[in-house]
Interface confidence: low
């Protein structure tokens, strides 16, 4: 599923991401835009053999199990395939664990490079939330 900007903002808000660990909703929508272009089915292979999955591009080395990443820790205790669902519950729940891990949203390279320090509120402007 490819979400609309405001559609995703509403879904993320419903799942409790607004101001989760101090990060406003705009941060999460911005991260999703530059990680996956709002596509729940996005996958990208990394040079270390791991793969990033879903709308928030969650990595199989640490967070989920895809049966194909040597040394996977699966800290979210989920199959990576769950992160590709049009239902973002699994991605959101895992993202909450990631953002609580110490580095906050710096864990997402796209957020660090494209969203951090910018007017992230622009990503939810005009949305009926």
């Amino acid at each position: 599923k490819v979400f609309g900007r405001c559609e995703l903002a509403a879904a993320m808000k419903r799942h409790g991401l607004d101001n989760y660990r101090g990060y406003s909703l705009g941060n999460w929508v911005c991260a999703a835009k530059f990680e996956s272009n709002f596509n729940t089915q996005a996958t990208n292979r990394n040079t270390d053999g791991s793969t990033d999955y879903g709308i928030l591009q969650i990595n199989s080395r640490w967070w989920c199990n895809d049966g194909r990443t040597p040394g996977s820790r699966n800290l979210c205790n989920i199959p990576c395939s769950a992160l590709l669902s049009s239902d973002i519950t699994a991605s959101v729940n895992c993202a909450k664990k990631i953002v609580s891990d110490g580095n906050g949203m710096n864990a997402w390279v796209a957020w660090r490079n494209r969203c951090k320090g910018t007017d992230v509120q622009a990503w939810i402007r005009g949305c009926r939330l």
């Epitope: 596509n39 089915q41 053999g49 895809d66 049966g67 194909r68 040597p70 040394g71 395939s81 590709l84």
Partner: antibody, heavy 115, light 107 residues
């Protein structure tokens, strides 16, 4: 139950192209990798590459880049592999399999003869 | 690419014998090694995943062991239905590679 049904045997002329299909049933097609494997007598099993149908992401064995092209149709739960510029070296049995690092489910194989 | 070398190429046994098939990797692959059985004109069948995890429906006489570069598939008291080809496969890195196979045949 999980099943992978491949298309039937093909006899092709050198230089032609062929498209082999693999219809998946019994699981969520979009979220598992489909692998393609070549088997020739005396050459064992060779991994050609893989496609994740939901995203269209593909990864190829360098040896088969330019030879094989993977596509998938999520409306029919079918993966395809096209082989181009066929030569006698392409004569083989081609398998699709569901990929989880290991391959627990396989198609029955498609025999390709190039002559 | 990681090379997998299987030995012996052919193993002639009598039903009831116990046998060991070897798979050696050109570099360490941790436990990311899987075993398949293939009968003539059939697709491969996964027997053991991740070195030692038996698949459901596979007889308990099949077991796997090893780590790093040396792996073994053991068949305790071979039965006539066990004859065929056996392949190992690694999932430690891309491209995925298979061993050349061991043919288990009746003596």
């Amino acid at each position: 139950q999980v099943q992978l049904q491949e298309s039937g045997a093909e006899v092709m002329k050198p230089g032609a192209s062929v498209k082999i299909s693999c219809k998946a049933t019994g699981y969520t097609f979009t979220t598992y990798w489909i692998e393609w494997v070549k088997q020739r007598p005396g050459h064992g099993l060779e991994w050609i590459g893989e496609i994740l149908p939901g995203s269209g992401s593909t990864y190829y064995n360098e040896k088969f880049k330019g030879k094989a092209t993977f596509t998938a149709d999520t409306s029919s739960n079918t993966a395809y592999m096209q082989l181009s510029s066929l030569t006698s070296e392409d004569s083989a049995v081609y398998y699709c399999a569901r990929g989880d690092g290991h391959y627990g489910y396989w198609g029955q194989g498609t025999t390709l003869t190039v002559s | 690419d990681i090379e997998l070398t299987q030995s012996p190429a052919t193993l002639s046994v009598t039903p009831g014998d116990s046998v060991s098939l070897s798979c050696r990797a050109s570099q360490s692959i941790s436990n990311n090694l899987h075993w398949y059985q293939q009968k003539p004109h059939e697709s491969p069948r996964l027997l053991i995943k991740y070195t030692s995890q038996s698949m459901s429906g596979i007889p308990s006489r099949f077991s796997g062991s090893g780590s790093g570069t040396d792996f073994t598939l053991s068949i305790n008291s071979v039965e006539t239905e066990d004859f065929g080809m056996y392949f190992c496969q690694q999932s430690n890195s891309w491209p995925r590679t298979f061993g050349g196979g061991t043919k288990l045949e009746i003596k």
